[in-house]
């Protein structure tokens, strides 16, 4: 028998890389049965997410997954970095794992910084 | 060399709907992070964006003008059409056609093309 | 949308003058403004991007700074070839929008 629960459907350590200047959708896969739950993005800064209240959302529905979308308008530089989503269900925070946006300058985009690099040198992400 | 032209009428009834073209060369709509789009200046007035073509597919319009405006790539001839329905005398301007790299600066732009709108 | 505002919306300079014109956006743009120069009849050309990088190509008399909501363009010498009208657009967010222009003419 299918769980009724809420499931969010973001891969452990997903990543997207992408360009400053270019529109993008960051999708949330989102299953539930009956009532559509509220969900909301967040940003991680170091142990706390915070959460993106200004910025533009929608719902995008399929046959078997809804999917909740965080609307880039364009990318900018300083979105780099890791966002999760989180999705209120009768009284329950269920937490998406997060995925990560590598934000790149169109003239880097093909070096790639590794993880241990943006750490130590932020700077390489908008050269 | 990047260089891009308009082309199209220089004069349209109201009403009617304006097709102009852009025709570029020195890049490709299809590399990472290019994008052509549109911006107008009526004579003695201000700047205005109006629509742009990403490498993507992804386009975007100006929200005062969405339900008029169509752009169009045809990525094999190096062209981009701008299809503007309803004109009307205030959107009599100069339209030029501009080229992005990357953030969304124009560094390259066509020489222009004025419109009239009049009966 | 993001409206653009500058002043002032013309200026009287002498050659060797040093110019100053600002920018203010409605809402925090980060860094994510140009500045473009527009001579009568011709497309305008980009000199300064992300609110202080010169473009290649344009001389270095022409800078640029300041972030959030408030920006400035300054010509250290006003060259002849510099009167002009200054635009400044934002490129945090669709639509992208310019400012109203400053005129630079001979004083």
């Known amino acids: 028998k299918e769980s009724c629960d809420v499931q969010l459907y973001i891969k452990r350590q997903s990543e997207h890389s992408i360009l400053a200047g270019d529109p993008f959708e960051l999708e949330c896969p989102v299953k539930y049965c009956a009532n559509r739950p509220h969900v909301t993005w967040c940003k991680l800064n170091g142990t706390t997410c915070v959460k993106l209240e200004d910025r533009q959302t929608s719902w995008k529905e399929e046959k078997n997954i809804s999917f909740f979308i965080l609307h880039f308008e364009p990318v900018l530089p300083n979105d780099n970095g890791s966002y999760r989503c989180s999705a209120n269900f009768q009284s329950n925070l269920i937490e998406s794992h997060s995925t990560t946006l590598y934000v790149t300058d169109v003239k880097s985009a093909s070096e790639r910084p590794s993880k241990d690099e943006m750490a130590s040198r932020p700077w390489l992400l908008y050269r | 060399q990047i260089t891009l032209k308009e082309s199209g009428p220089t004069l349209v009834k109201p009403t009617q709907t304006l097709t102009l073209t852009c025709t570029f060369s020195?890049?490709?709509?299809?590399?990472?992070?290019?994008?052509v789009g549109w911006i107008r200046q009526p004579p003695g007035k201000a700047l205005e964006w109006l629509a742009q073509?990403?490498?993507?597919?992804?386009?975007r319009y100006s929200p005062s003008l969405k339900s008029r405006l169509t752009i169009t790539k045809d990525t094999s001839k190096n062209q981009v059409v701008l299809t503007m329905t309803n004109m009307d005398p205030v959107d009599t301007a100069t339209y030029y056609c501009?080229?992005?790299?990357?953030?969304?600066?124009?560094?390259?732009w066509g020489q222009g093309t004025l419109v009239t709108v009049s009966s | 949308d993001i409206q653009m505002t500058q002043s002032p919306s013309s200026v009287s300079a002498s050659v060797g003058d040093r110019v100053t014109i600002t920018c203010r956006a409605s809402?925090?743009?980060?860094?994510?403004l140009a500045w473009y120069q527009q001579k009568p009849g011709k497309a305008p050309k980009l000199l300064i991007y992300?609110?202080?990088g010169l473009q290649s190509g344009v001389p270095s008399r022409f800078s640029g700074s300041g972030s959030g909501t408030d920006f400035t363009l300054t010509i250290s010498s006003l060259q002849p070839e510099d009167f002009a009208t200054y635009y400044c657009?934002?490129?945090?967010?669709?639509?992208?929008?310019f400012g109203p222009g400053t005129k630079v003419d001979i004083k």
């Open positions: 501009t080229h992005k790299l990357g953030m969304n600066y124009f560094d390259y």
């Open positions: 020195g890049f490709s709509l299809s590399t990472s992070g290019v994008g």
């Open positions: 073509e990403f490498w993507t597919g992804d386009k």
């Open positions: 809402q925090g743009i980060s860094s994510w």
């Open positions: 992300a609110a202080s």
């Open positions: 657009q934002q490129a945090n967010s669709f639509p992208f929008t």
